[in-house]
Interface confidence: medium
């Protein structure tokens, strides 16, 4: 498909001249950021961004790649080096420590320097590193965590927890020996390490005692409370704040977000991770966009500003399953949340960053025609005389041999939301990838986001932009009209 | 491997604070660029950049990812959308038209708008678009093309040629009907379309009549001249300029580059593409770094400045073979050329851009330990109880079934320069990938390189920075001390 207007050189020359004009107008703001938002696309490497752009464009009846994601509109871009101290290819725990605390850690640890060792409880104490969210709170800002995973998951936990094992969601997941040594589960740390104003995502079951039925799935014992210590962490959290509200469904969330008496809001919408966007029951569970909007409504009441972490956490899960349909539809919802946040905030006073913790071994090749489905087949056949998809994985569960050979695939099969793209190597779960990821930035001090940087730089830019520790002597003018 | 110094949070905090300090000091230059250099890593997607960084670091006895490529030091980064008008995943012809001429074209066409159709000679005339190199020449600058492929290959051809078929290297490749319609081969266009001061790379055989023995392989008929028109294009080119010199080996190149009487230099060091760096005979063939240095020595004599195109063109070829060793060692030599150019030029007056035309379906995953070989195995086994490499391809010739199963691999096999990494789909040649690629920028007007842009933006930034057509009214101050 060749769009007629694109055949004319004037189309491209005019478009580029406009882009140049916009680039020339870019003026680095010399003011401090009142608000900080970090949007984290878990597993959202550059190949995921491009494929999602095409899909989002095609959902709007465009050819695809010429369209813009919300994140594409951010004026500044850098590349972020994601390796952990001990691994070339990292996990979401070590990376969360990097972009939220400004220090690199070891694989599967969270909120700890690399002096801590995975699963060794006695290496925790003294190696804690403090997140930018925690520092924002100490500076009088309101703070929030929003995710499509469980709120105790590796990425959001980087904002508040310190643990040698990212899998210690509730005390039932922590070995007795580690509990005796004083190592706390992540759910406990969620409510006790610091005061978080807004907590939205999944993860109900880690907050309640074993045997507590889940409100949404009361007959499903496996979805009920998991805690061995008998604690009801939601109750404990509610008791801490007079204006605290706990909600577990969309209707309650929308009500609470508009209620001026609510100062603290915890919404846990699934026992574990939230459902994929394509499986979400829109009457019961809010979308990531809706959770983001609710968080911003509450947090923006604080005249001193806020810090908000928003995670599209299941992009990663779709990729691990080698189900690109899930990964890409999650990415689009993540981008929709970015777009909505942009409408609800001002780039005059809000530094917004979009990045990924790491990438995936996910590729988009095969020379497909413009406008063809991102989930479709490449033109021509492979060397085994069978069709193949444009989307493929280096490794993962999509590897199948049928009668000792690679299976053929049709356009209708490859377009199914359940289809697993093929891979070179058979694994139960497709792996992360180690290449640099993009950082998109907009707002005060966004111009500092440049070049190729360590992932830790992200936390430092946020801290500096808002004059938080260790950059309280940041020498930035407060935005005109800022209240304190 | 955990470096002791990296266990200390101070290491990361100090490093990030320094990076912030450098970011704060960045001052967009308001001057015009006297010189333009575009470094094109053919097929150098972000996954290739990261893997090459690690390899280059490890060759210097470092762990790898913490080190810097020369391109990593460039202060500004953007993402470039590489699709062609007719394909989601492009080729090197359409992309060359974009980043060198500022207009997107169709797959496998060069220097033509998308109104031209692949292989249809009669759609050429009237659809030609003019490269920035051509515009630089018209403005009185010296211009050069340096590549490790044949100089008539798609990427360099974007700087001087207009053709509906990128494969028309010599007239022997052009169908008789197209020749009769007046369509010229690329080699002819190389010497006749415009005056190029420096031409360095491979591609001897396309310049000489059929039956002309090659100077390096005189007994190998298949490497001799291919032309049917009986023309000796080198002779024709030499006759155009009093100070013109033709060389075909490294010794002659080094002599010519230091000879003040040489005003124009053509060096063709192989009949076709140049050898891979790991196979290069260092007495006969120059490296990309040496060719770049030679070009800069000649071009920088012009007080009005220069335009130089430098291509690491065989990164792409290594990937097409699914031989990551070749792709990554080519990337390192490309980066070495960037480094050398940086030493020979000043960022006060030279805008340098580094980018790729497109990516490849190449991934780096599997959670390898820090410091482990980039060509090594992932920890653990795959679901078929066999080892697997951290580097893999989505598709390509590395797909093999042995006794109806995926072959096992050892560390010594995977470390071999000949090893083909496995792929999900068997193809004769691994394909390009469609995700955005990075653009790195340094020098006057480099700050305009920002955000997510169409690939065409690159040509426009260069033209604007040097006040070339259509931006002659660029309103930029000439650099202090610039002579005319």
């Amino acid at each position: 498909i060749i769009p007629v207007e694109e055949e004319n050189p004037d189309f491209w020359n005019r478009q580029a001249a406009e882009a140049l004009g916009a680039a020339k107008k870019l003026q680095p703001a010399q003011t401090a950021a009142k608000n900080l938002i970090i949007f984290l696309g878990d597993g959202m490497g550059v190949s995921t961004v491009t494929a999602a752009r095409i899909l989002k464009g095609q959902k709007k009846d465009k050819l695809g790649p010429e369209t813009f994601l919300a994140m594409d509109r951010f004026p500044y871009v850098a590349l972020s080096k994601t390796y952990s101290v001990d691994k070339h290819v990292p996990d979401s725990g070590a990376t969360a420590t990097a972009y939220l605390c400004g220090v690199k850690g070891n694989f599967q640890t969270i909120g700890l320097s690399a002096a801590a060792r995975f699963n060794q409880c006695n290496t925790t104490r003294g190696n804690e590193v403090i997140s930018v969210m925690n520092r924002a709170k100490k500076a009088g800002k309101s703070v929030g965590v929003v995710t499509t995973t469980r709120v105790q998951h590796a990425s959001p936990a980087g904002a508040y927890a310190h643990t040698v094992n990212r899998n210690w969601y509730s005390d039932a997941d922590v070995p007795a020996s580690a509990r005796q040594e004083g190592c706390q589960d992540i759910a406990t740390q969620l409510i006790s390490n610091m005061d978080i104003d807004v907590i939205l995502g999944g993860g109900r079951k880690y907050m309640f005692p074993m045997g507590t039925p889940d409100p949404e799935y009361p007959d499903d014992y496996s979805q009920g409370g998991t805690r061995l210590d008998g604690k009801n962490l939601v109750q404990e959290w509610l008791a801490k704040h007079q204006g605290a509200r706990y909600v577990w469904n969309r209707t309650e969330l929308l009500q609470a977000s508009l209620d001026p008496s609510v100062t603290h809001l915890m919404g846990l919408f699934e026992p574990g991770d939230m459902k994929y966007e394509i499986h979400r029951d829109s009457t019961l569970d809010p979308s990531l966009m809706e959770m983001t909007e609710a968080a911003l409504l509450l947090l923006s009441r604080n005249p001193r500003g806020f810090f908000l972490f928003v995670e599209g956490g299941r992009i990663d899960h779709g990729h691990h399953e080698s189900r690109a349909y899930r990964a890409l539809t999650e990415t689009i919802m993540f981008d929709d949340a970015i777009e909505r946040a942009g409408q609800l905030t001002s780039e005059e006073d809000t530094l917004s960053l979009v990045t990924a913790d790491h990438s995936h071994v996910f590729s988009f090749g095969g020379y497909p025609l413009r406008g063809s489905s991102i989930f479709g087949l490449a033109p021509g056949k492979a060397r085994d005389r069978k069709a193949y998809t444009v989307l493929l994985y280096g490794n993962g569960p999509g590897y199948v041999l049928k009668d000792g050979a690679r299976p053929d695939v049709t356009e209708s099969e490859s377009g199914s939301p359940e289809y697993r793209q093929q891979s070179a190597v058979p694994l139960d779960g497709e792996t992360h990838a180690g290449e640099d990821v993009a950082v998109f930035a907009r707002g005060p001090q966004a111009h500092l986001v440049h070049g190729v940087q360590e992932q830790t730089f992200i936390a430092h830019v946020m801290a500096f932009a808002a004059c938080l520790e260790p950059y309280t002597a940041c020498d930035l003018a407060p935005r005109a009209g800022t209240t304190d | 491997i955990i470096p002791v110094e990296e266990e200390n949070p101070d290491f990361w905090n100090r490093q990030a604070a320094e990076a912030l300090g450098a970011a704060k000091k960045l001052q967009p230059a308001q001057t015009a660029a006297k010189n333009l250099i575009i470094f094109l890593g053919d097929g150098m997607g972000v996954s290739t950049v990261t893997a090459a960084r690690i390899l280059k670091g490890q060759k210097k006895d470092k762990l790898g990812p913490e080190t810097f490529l020369a391109m990593d030091r460039f202060p500004y980064v953007a993402l470039s959308k590489t699709y062609s008008v007719d394909k989601h995943v492009p080729d090197s012809g359409a992309t060359a038209t974009a980043y060198l001429c500022g207009v997107k074209g169709n797959f496998q066409t060069i220097g033509l708008s998308a109104a031209a159709r692949f292989n249809q000679c009669n759609t050429t005339r009237g659809n030609e678009v003019i490269s920035v190199m051509n515009r630089a020449k018209k403005a009185g600058k010296s211009v050069g093309v340096v590549t490790t492929t044949r100089v008539q290959h798609a990427s360099p051809a974007g700087a001087y040629a207009h053709t509906v078929n990128r494969n028309w290297y010599s007239d022997a490749d052009v169908p008789a009907s197209a020749r009769q319609e007046g369509c010229q081969d690329i080699a002819t266009q190389l010497i006749s379309n415009m005056d190029i001061d420096v031409i360095l790379g491979g591609g001897r055989k396309y310049m000489f009549p059929m039956g002309t023995p090659d100077p390096e392989y005189p007994d190998d008929y298949s490497q001799g001249g291919t032309r049917l028109d009986g023309k000796n294009l080198v002779q024709e080119w030499l006759a155009k300029h009093q100070g013109a010199r033709y060389v075909w080996n490294r010794t002659e190149l080094l002599q010519a580059s230091l000879d003040p009487s040489v005003t124009h230099l053509m060096g063709l060091f192989e009949p076709g593409d140049m050898k891979y760096e790991i196979h290069r005979d260092s007495t006969l063939d120059p490296s990309l770094m040496e060719m770049t240095e030679a070009a800069l020595l000649l071009l920088s004599r012009n007080p009005r400045g220069f335009f130089l195109f430098v291509e690491g063109g065989r990164i792409d070829h290594g990937h097409h073979e699914s031989r990551a060793y070749r792709a990554l060692t080519e990337t390192i030599m490309f980066d070495d050329a960037i480094e050398r150019a940086g030493q020979l030029t000043s960022e006060e007056d030279t805008l340098s851009l580094v980018t790729a035309d497109h990516s490849h379906v190449f991934s780096f995953g599997g959670y390898p330990l820090r410091g482990s070989s980039i060509f090594g195995l992932a920890p653990g086994k795959a679901r078929d109880r066999k080892a697997y490499t951290v580097l893999l391809y989505g598709n390509g010739p590395g797909y093999v079934l042995k006794d109806g199963a995926r072959p096992d691999v050892t560390e010594s096999e995977s470390g071999s320069p000949e090893y083909r990494q496995q792929s999900a789909v068997p193809l004769d040649g691994e394909t390009h990938a469609g995700e955005d690629v990075a653009v790195f920028a340094r020098g006057p007007q480099a700050h305009l390189v920002h955000g997510v842009q169409e690939q065409t933006f690159i040509a426009h930034v260069m033209a604007f920075a040097a006040c070339l057509e259509p931006y002659t009214a660029c309103d930029l101050a000439p650099r202090a001390g610039t002579t005319d």
Epitope: - | R280, S416, E418
Partner: antibody, heavy 123, light 106 residues
Framework: EVQLVESGGGLVQPGRSLRLSCTAS????????MSWVRQAPGKGLEWLAL??????????EYTASVKGRFTISRDNSKSILYLQMNSLKTEDTAVYYC??????????????WGQGTLVTVSS | DTQMTQSPSSLSASVGDRVTITCKAS??????IAWFQYKTGKAPKLFIH???TLQPGVPSRFSGSGSGRDYTLTISSLQPEDIATYYC????????FGQGTKLEIK
């Protein structure tokens, strides 16, 4: 002109060792992959070992039948290729050739060969 | 490791005959096959590389073809000086020779 001259062959008893040499000239020795190939009496050609060039760190590869017994090495200052053969067996009796790869053709085909040196393993 | 199966092991033909020798690889070798001529007491001589490219000085009656796993050496019109043993060599993955084909004149 590329020249390869093997030496060091002769009669040796089973279980003993022998070192073959191949002196190279006419090309930049460090830039090329070098191999040893043999031909046993009445048998076909058998590739034995490879040592890569400077750019690839002079890494080595062997065929299964000689792995652990034979070692390929090179003295780049003298442009000499070696094959150290230990624990020799009667079936190692053959003419041993050294060969240089050519990269021009995008592969590593054995383009240049020496004349060979005869090794006889017998008690 | 890649195995090469060469056939026939010996071949008797008359001067002027068209002669075909085949090599089958155990896996796809991506056209990385060479053919050598070997005469007793001499070093093997490279005749064809990359499936079909003739070495300098090799008569044009020799040709090579094939792809994937199957490859062929053809002599279009056998000459007395062509009497020798011919070996194929895969060089896609290290090196493996075929068993050889001994060519004789009837």
């Amino acid at each position: 002109e590329v020249q390869l001259v093997e030496s060091g062959g002769g009669l040796v008893q089973p279980g003993r060792s022998l070192r073959l040499s191949c002196t190279a000239s006419g090309f930049t020795f460090t830039d090329y992959y070098m191999s040893w190939v043999r031909q046993a009496p009445g048998k076909g050609l058998e590739w034995l070992a490879l040592i890569r060039n400077k750019a690839t760190g002079y890494t080595t590869e062997y065929t299964a039948s000689v792995k652990g017994r034979f070692t390929i090495s090179r003295d780049n200052s003298k442009s000499i290729l070696y094959l150290q053969m230990n624990s020799l067996k009667t079936e190692d009796t053959a003419v041993y050739y050294c060969a240089r790869a050519s990269f021009y053709y995008d592969g590593k085909v054995l383009a240049y060969w020496g004349q060979g040196t005869l090794v006889t393993v017998s008690s | 490791d890649t195995q090469m199966t060469q056939s026939p092991s010996s071949l008797s033909a008359s001067v002027g005959d068209r002669v075909t020798i085949t090599c089958k690889a155990s896996q796809d070798i991506n056209k990385y096959i060479a053919w050598f001529q070997y005469k007793t007491g001499k070093a093997p001589k490279l005749f064809i590389h990359y499936t079909s490219t003739l070495q300098p000085g090799v008569p044009s009656r020799f040709s090579g073809s094939g792809s994937g796993r199957d490859y062929t050496l053809t002599i279009s019109s056998l000459q007395p000086e062509d009497i020798a043993t011919y070996y194929c060599l895969q060089y896609d993955n290290l090196y493996t020779f075929g068993q050889g084909t001994k060519l004789e004149i009837k």
